[in-house]
Interface confidence: low
Amino acid sequence: LQDPCSNCPAGTFCDNNRNQICSPCPPNSFSSAGGQRTCDICRQCKGVFRTRKECSSTSNAECDCTPGFHCLGAGCSMCEQDCKQGQELTKKGCKDCCFGTFNDQKRGICRPWTNCSLDGKSVLVNGTKERDVVCGPSPADLSPGASSVTPPAPAREPGHSPQ
């Protein structure tokens, strides 16, 4: 025998209190599939979360993060603070990358500069807190008079970048 509830479409629920009539989901709830006996409560995007997509009778609300924060976790379950390029987020807030490391994004961790010598190459452009080293040709490839490479600027000391 076919379950009468299976005829209830998404956006409705099978109301046992009303002889299994398909009733629309109440406000602030949804059912994304047919044949549901209850509707799910819509997610509320509060605090640092903001609404990216409003809840409808057939789909849940979707949240993202307010400016200055970015999403973490499945379905943006958490918001984490942005930092500036050249910084990483620590327990006590945004901190400049240590000398020898960089971060070219507003999120994530500082990563070590590329070690050009491991590939037998020379440093073409020094690294900064925001940018990785640029490796150039190997020193042997730079025959006298053939190079137009400008000498690299001195590497920036940690903690002295303008905020």
Epitope: K46, G47, V48, F49, T66, F69, G73, M78, C79, E80, Q81, L89, T90, K91, K92, G93
Partner: nanobody, 128 residues
């Protein structure tokens, strides 16, 4: 001295309810995200729920969604976990944790390493 003192645990039958409390002192409570973590016998720690410093953001593990409610009263420096429809698998020691909320005003984390301070725990046993 920082202190987190949990209370409200005990023995309850399946389907029953308990309300855990965590009284905090020694730090600026409203600046800290708070969390509940549990550890069942012979198992690792499981993050149950977390709430931001201003109470605006909350997180629940899938295993407790719709049954547990986390809340906080910043005027009383107290964190709460209302646990309804308890199941045998909810049996564990429940720990309260506090982490400085650099994510303020809406930040929280489910990484245990985020949390600076931990309570001693309160035992919850669900059994008939």
């Amino acid at each position: 001295e920082v202190q987190l003192v949990e209370s409200g645990g005990g023995l309850v039958q399946p389907g029953g309810s308990l309300r855990l409390s965590c009284a905090a002192s020694g730090f600026t409570f409203s600046s800290y995200a708070m969390g509940w973590v549990r550890q069942a016998p012979g198992k690792g720690r499981e993050f149950v729920s977390a709430i931001s410093g201003n109470g605006g953001s909350t997180y629940y593990a899938d295993s407790v969604k719709g049954r547990f409610t986390i809340s906080r009263d910043n005027s009383k420096n107290t964190l709460y976990l209302q646990m309804n429809s308890l199941r045998a698998e909810d049996t564990a020691v429940y720990y309260c944790a506090a982490g400085y909320s650099y994510l303020y005003p809406g930040g929280l984390s489910t990484r245990p390493s985020f949390y600076d301070y931990w309570g001693q725990g309160t035992q919850v046993t669900v059994s008939s």
